[in-house]
Amino acid sequence: MNGRVDYLVTEEEINLTRGPSGLGFNIVGGTDQQYVSNDSGIYVSRIKENGAAALDGRLQEGDKILSVNGQDLKNLLHQDAVDLFRNAGYAVSLRVQHRLQVQNGPIGHRGEGDPSGIPIFMVLVPVFALTMVAAWAFMRYRQQL
């Protein structure tokens, strides 16, 4: 039986200033280079040490970039996405999706770059409820002794 890989998904607006060597990261993805199955989105594959993105500290490897200066990155060829970044100017605004991975249950294999999973609150709420019920039952049992 495989365990699930679950994700807490958050979005953030990151404003970067292009440094001497540029923005300082690499990307994968695009309609012609699907890095994640059934997802042609653009993902950060590497952040260059001491580059603009690394010095800012908010962009992370594995983040999905949703837009650049308000321009949607959906349904773009890989090279078109690269060119969009290169022509984005000195001040670059990125809309980014972060995914915090949480492993639940037995560890099962998942394909490289596969982000499928369920929001973590859907797991935490039932677990919390069960814990409270168990604590209540325990206290009732102790009172009867």
Epitope: G22, L23, F25, N26, I27, V82, E112
Partner: nanobody, 126 residues
Framework: DVQLVESGGGLVQAGGSLRLSCAAS????????MGWFRQAPGKEREFVAA??????LYSDSVKGRFTISRDNAKNTVYLQMNSLKPEDTAVYYC??????????????????????WGQGTQVTVS
Amino acid sequence: DVQLVESGGGLVQAGGSLRLSCAASGRTFSTYTMGWFRQAPGKEREFVAAVTWSETLYSDSVKGRFTISRDNAKNTVYLQMNSLKPEDTAVYYCAAVQGSPVDTIVVLTTSEEYDYWGQGTQVTVS
């Protein structure tokens, strides 16, 4: 991690040709930018050529003589070297990094841009 294994080096006369190969492990080879560097005895490692998903870049010293190409189905990148000169004598290294740089492709001429390196193959031009 990605393992890189170069082959195809050897001894060749000036004006001759060689084709170097670099075989890579990993299921997402096509997403990697691949580069070739070389290091002659007593000299620093020097950029030769690179290929991203859809771009190629060459050093001025090999432009028009060397051709970099990739076969994603075979997880292999090639360096076709024609009109070889004695000054091309060096150990040739294959390098890899995942993704394409969002900055000018010229950043790929620096070795710091790459995360994975092969052991190298010797090319000697007499």
